[in-house]
Amino acid sequence: QELFPQWHLPIKIAAIIASLTFLYTLLREVIHPLATSHQQYFYKIPILVINKVLPMVSITLLALVYLPGVIAAIVQLHNGTKYKKFPHWLDKWMLTRKQFGLLSFFFAVLHAIYSLSYPMRRSYRYKLLNWAYQQVQQNKEDAWIEHDVWRMEIYVSLGIVGLAILALLAVTSIPSVSDSLTWREFHYIQSKLGIVSLLLGTIHALIFAWNKWIDIKQFVWYTPPTFMIAVFLPIVVLIFKSILFLPCLRKKILKI
Amino acid sequence: QELFPQWHLPIKIAAIIASLTFLYTLLREVIHPLATSHQQYFYKIPILVINKVLPMVSITLLALVYLPGVIAAIVQLHNGTKYKKFPHWLDKWMLTRKQFGLLSFFFAVLHAIYSLSYPMRRSYRYKLLNWAYQQVQQNKEDAWIEHDVWRMEIYVSLGIVGLAILALLAVTSIPSVSDSLTWREFHYIQSKLGIVSLLLGTIHALIFAWNKWIDIKQFVWYTPPTFMIAVFLPIVVLIFKSILFLPCLRKKILKI
Amino acid sequence: QELFPQWHLPIKIAAIIASLTFLYTLLREVIHPLATSHQQYFYKIPILVINKVLPMVSITLLALVYLPGVIAAIVQLHNGTKYKKFPHWLDKWMLTRKQFGLLSFFFAVLHAIYSLSYPMRRSYRYKLLNWAYQQVQQNKEDAWIEHDVWRMEIYVSLGIVGLAILALLAVTSIPSVSDSLTWREFHYIQSKLGIVSLLLGTIHALIFAWNKWIDIKQFVWYTPPTFMIAVFLPIVVLIFKSILFLPCLRKKILKI
């Protein structure tokens, strides 16, 4: 028999998103500076480029955990019954949500470790020394940029909390742990906490973006930065989740 | 039925400690400088203040895992028998030790991640650049402060080892893992390694404190720094554990 | 009965390797500078020395997971049958491979955390400030060393990916997780991914080494640096694995 049948779809999707994001980031971060000003930024590939790919894959996969639930609710509302069978593709997707979630967590953890490794890199050390040299040359006593400090303190903190919640979801997916929970407890963690972690991940990305939305320098060769693309699907899911949470629709769904 | 009945008490206690520590740290780190010299340190809230709360909660919860055992031993010694029923509150507490321990580990991991994120923050980068500028201004060739270096090398190392041991306790709490152990093996890990991690956590906090016990600057508005409050309960537990480990008392308890 | 019978051998081996590596690193990093130029580097013990020990133990234990399989294959090829009993020591070793692997992962995680803690240490801060001061004094505009940047970006990235794969192996070792997998799935993860992580760990070490193989300064008191010793066994295992993977030998083994 086949190996890991339930993992095929999530791994395929993850691989596609990862490949596309890698090529897209490579184009923007490495090929563009090479083509336009002969700057060689190939050293960025092993960590900086990879670490643009990881959060993109992670947040997209997490959105794909909650998107089929949204679609299913819309389908049920449209059909007016829960007894009509879902289309095959949606059924298949619904059954692989756990795998999507675990993959999302895997990529999120990798993203965290890659991020934490930033200041230990030689590239960062050399940049710091050069910045210090420039600060002395410019006779600039204070390097502090208040809004930039705020931006990073907030998005790092939210990212850690989001990852922590995602970790709880992952732990409760361990068979013997989920077996020790009642169905209501398991459902509570997976649905409520899952959406909270998606929300935190989205806010984390938006605060990372900060004022870059209107920064023309971000639009390399007229392409938007990855975070803009990354937050699109999560925002869609969160909006629909919020709409379906409205009392009128919520009652209708519960009736069905 | 209720959701997560065994988690109610630990989560309540954790929430209370976290809230109080947050407000206390906020008072000392943010409100005091604002009130006394109009210094705006609000940027400290998302990471620095939170990361004073996390270890406080973690070490307190870990102490609360081993405190009921100490109380139970004292009650048994006082009663001279193990057949007399424990008071209801102690019984309830004894049954939620696993949850206290897992919550302690959760907060410890968060504390570790927050701590590891320190050097990647913009605030740290800007401070580093300012320090470098100032060192040049002062014409100071060597910034090295030996005792400070030692302090940090030791407390970081002990913290990591303590966390590693706590991780072993957490892993052996996974139902299928604990099922694969004999009762003696499980008890050995949970009791012996647990106390070792509490000891390491306490030493970690004490070495973090170093010479701050006698530094008048630490006593903001006559309030002691958080680490002083944090180590109180763990030290009490460790002292009682040591006393109950004395041959004379140990024999008595084993007899009972 | 005995506590943790299957863990005796792995823990003994790990303790021996750790102790020898610790003493060896102490000799090279602390005692040598003290004896030859009265430089006191004792502050290196809690983190820097320990973090030379951890990867050494980790990669050796990981190699020891796959070495008995290689030996078993050679024994079977030599005997021409799989029905002849393995020697007792090999049998015992084969049965403790899971424990060797989990210990390897434990040390790898510790190595990662210790490594990530480097830039948050005071010793690193003070060194950075001194380097910045020297750069200004030398009027050196650019500190960048391209090959050094490349070296670190690559070895850090490979190390993280290797650790991630090792984590997958560890997770699938949780009884309830392994129970949910078919034997073929479990075997696929443990054999294929295991060898991949050993390969990545070895490349990680080799790229860490970079051009240090021919750097005479690395040979303190004529002793090779730890990474040279560390990669020996993994390379042996990988070479033998590759040889046994050759079509001619692979067919022979499958026949047996």
């Epitope: 006593e141 204070d142 390097a143 502090w144 208040e146 | 400088p33 010299s37 109009h38 210094q39 705006q40 340190y41 605030s123 800007y126 401070k127 300012n130 320090w131 100032q134 201004q137 002062q138 014409n139 100071k140 060739e141 060597d142 | -």
Partner: antibody
């Protein structure tokens, strides 16, 4: 009680040299403090000359064109100001003053203790 | 170098008066990283050494009467004596310790009216 006592002032000819001393009592000069020299020309304001930190690093006012050197003798708990190539405009009362040593939180500190000063007159 | 400009250069006041001395720096003395203004105020009486009154622009040195207060941030600072006492007649200096070289204001002489 911390006390700083300057000495070594007096009349010196232009182009000459002079060494001022500042004896500290009640505190070790190698502890958590940096030590400054400040001068005040007759009827004028204060001018910072330079400082020596607890680690021994020094910094000077660029306007003095490297004519002045600050040093210390730890065993005598005394710091010194060596003045070379003296000019008439160097005539002033020279003070030594203490400031808390640089730290990574508060950076610099104000000068909290001053000596009574010693008069240096540069005249032919 | 950072220029420190004090005003007025001298003033006459009576006992009990409220006195305000201003000090302007040629650049900001506020370190944004720790939100401190690196400005000190000193009092000097004839034939005596200066005495520290205020540091970090607004923090009173221990032992200094509460009638002395400092305020301001960035480049504009003020020393206020809420009710002038006979022993307060002296010259007052502001000083920046934001960077090297340390620089002082030219001084403000407070005389009896």
């Amino acid at each position: 009680e911390v006390q700083l006592v300057e000495s070594g002032g007096g009349l010196v000819q232009p182009g000459g040299s002079l060494r001022l001393s500042c004896a500290a009592s009640g505190y070790s000069i190698t502890s958590d403090y940096a030590w400054n020299w400040i001068r005040q020309a007759p009827g004028k304001g204060l001018e910072w000359v330079g400082y020596i930190s607890n680690s021994g690093s020094t910094s000077y006012n660029p306007s003095l064109k490297s004519r002045f050197t600050i040093s210390r003798d730890n065993s005598k708990n005394t710091l010194y100001l060596q003045m070379n190539s003296l000019r008439a405009e160097d005539t002033a009362v020279y003070y030594c003053a203490r400031e808390r040593n640089y730290d990574y939180d508060d950076y610099y500190y104000a000068m909290d203790y001053w000596g009574q000063g010693t008069l240096v007159t540069v005249s032919s | 170098d950072i220029q420190m400009t004090q005003s007025p250069s001298s003033l006459s006041a009576s006992v009990g008066d409220r006195v305000t001395i201003t000090c302007k720096s040629s650049q900001s003395l506020l370190y944004r990283s720790n939100q401190k203004n690196y400005l000190a105020w000193y009092q000097q009486k004839p034939g005596k050494a200066p005495k520290l009154l205020i540091y970090w622009a607004s923090t009173r040195e221990s032992g200094v009467p509460s009638r002395f207060s400092g305020s301001g941030s960035g480049t504009d600072f003020t020393l206020t004596i809420s009710s002038l006492q006979p022993e307060d007649f002296a010259t007052y200096y502001c000083q920046q310790y934001y960077n090297y070289p340390r620089t002082f204001g030219q001084g403000t002489k407070v005389e009896i009216k």
